[in-house]
Interface confidence: low
């Protein structure tokens, strides 16, 4: 369990991730939760991966914003949009690949402030 905080006093929010593992060739979930906001339009979710230039996924103003998405994740990601309003920023990753393993950052912006937390994602053939 990793809990991250923003860096600017009262303008920080708590973001929580859980290290997880994905089965190669199946779908995976990268878990991330945050202090909810009452307005969906004020929430921005960004998923980033260490060593990857583009974004893994971005969700803002109530919908996906994938113009900056890295090619390796194109068409393979989704947030659970109906649950963002209650603080769920988890990412669904389709067709997990060996190369998806690594350190991910869940970065959240709301009207309350900003926060982020890292997540270690392992991939392999798990039973």
């Amino acid at each position: 369990l990793i809990i991250g905080f923003g860096i600017s006093g009262r303008h920080s929010i708590t973001v929580t991730t859980v290290a997880s593992a994905g089965n190669i060739g199946e779908d995976g979930i990268l878990s991330c939760t945050f202090e909810p906001d009452i307005k969906l339009s004020d929430i921005v979710i960004q998923w980033l991966k260490e060593g990857v230039l583009g974004l893994v996924h971005e969700f803002k103003e109530g919908k996906d914003e994938l113009s900056e998405q890295d090619e390796m994740f194109r068409g393979r990601t989704a947030v659970f949009a109906d649950q963002v309003i209650v603080g769920n920023a988890s990412l669904r990753l389709k067709n997990v690949q060996l190369t998806d393993a690594g350190t991910y950052k869940c970065y959240i912006i709301t009207s309350k402030g900003k926060g982020n937390a890292n997540l270690e994602y392992k991939t392999g053939a798990f039973s």
Epitope: I29, G75, N95
Partner: antibody
Framework: QLQLQESGPGLVKPSETLSLTCTVS??????????WGWIRQPPGKGLEWIGN???????YYNPSLRSRVTISVDTSKNQFSLKLSSVTAADTAVYYC????????????WGQGTLVTVSS | EIVMTQSPATLSVSPGERATLSCRAS??????LAWYQQKPGQAPRLLIY???TRATGIPARFSGSGSGTEFTLTISSLQSEDFAVYYC?????????FGGGTKVEIK
């Protein structure tokens, strides 16, 4: 073998909420390798994917229906359910539940389907 | 969303003949494509996934090919039980989408 069976009212009034349940038999809904989905087919037309749910409760909905759809799961009953609010005549369709593979995401097997008519 | 277009809308074929059905995606879906068969009053049945892999129990006369944006379902020798509507479905990107279907009817 795995079987899915839809159940629920066949007639719903406009502006009301359509509610259907899919009962899974011959296997556990808690299998980690599958999602559980809903697909609909208006009379004489093609198929439209509504959304799906993982046994943990994580959902993904078709953006075209997202504002009106809720899919939930009851692992103790081996069931998952669909609610579609504010229905109109355009929501009249055969509603199917199906198991969705966790990549490849093909649908197999399907329930036999249930016709829901929206009419006053 | 990715739009799937099937052609022709209706295909008239005699029993024993070959049927070739086409499915085109509005953008590349790699090999993330499935084919289904639907008979009147029945639920769809999975035939092919991964563009070319036959599902369990599907006869060898059904074959799928293609990748990217162009896909084909071939029924090598039509049997009476093959007359039905066929749908393609992409699972490359959310939301998953289906083609409009091709009805294979007896000539």
């Amino acid at each position: 073998q795995l079987q899915l069976q839809e159940s629920g009212p066949g007639l719903v009034k406009p502006s009301e909420t359509l509610s259907l349940t899919c009962t899974v038999s011959g296997g556990s809904i808690k299998s980690g390798s599958y999602y559980w989905g809903w697909i609909r087919q208006p009379p004489g037309k093609g198929l439209e994917w509504i959304g799906n749910i993982y046994y943990s409760g994580s959902t993904y909905y078709n953006p075209s229906l997202r504002s009106r759809v809720t899919i939930s799961v009851d692992t103790s009953k081996n069931q998952f359910s669909l609610k579609l609010s504010s229905v109109t005549a355009a929501d009249t369709a055969v509603y199917y539940c199906a198991r969705e593979g966790s990549y490849p995401n093909q649908f197999d097997p399907w329930g036999q389907g249930t016709l829901v008519t929206v009419s006053s | 969303e990715i739009v799937m277009t099937q052609s022709p809308a209706t295909l008239s074929v005699s029993p024993g003949e070959r049927a070739t059905l086409s499915c085109r995606a509005s953008q590349s879906v790699s090999s993330n494509l499935a084919w289904y068969q639907q008979k009147p009053g029945q639920a769809p049945r999975l035939l092919i996934y991964g563009a070319s892999t036959r599902a369990t129990g599907i006869p060898a006369r059904f074959s799928g090919s293609g990748s990217g944006t162009e896909f084909t379902l071939t029924i090598s020798s039509l049997q009476s039980e093959d007359f039905a509507v066929y749908y393609c479905q992409q699972y490359h990107s959310f939301p998953f989408t289906f083609g409009g279907g091709t009805k294979v009817e007896i000539k």
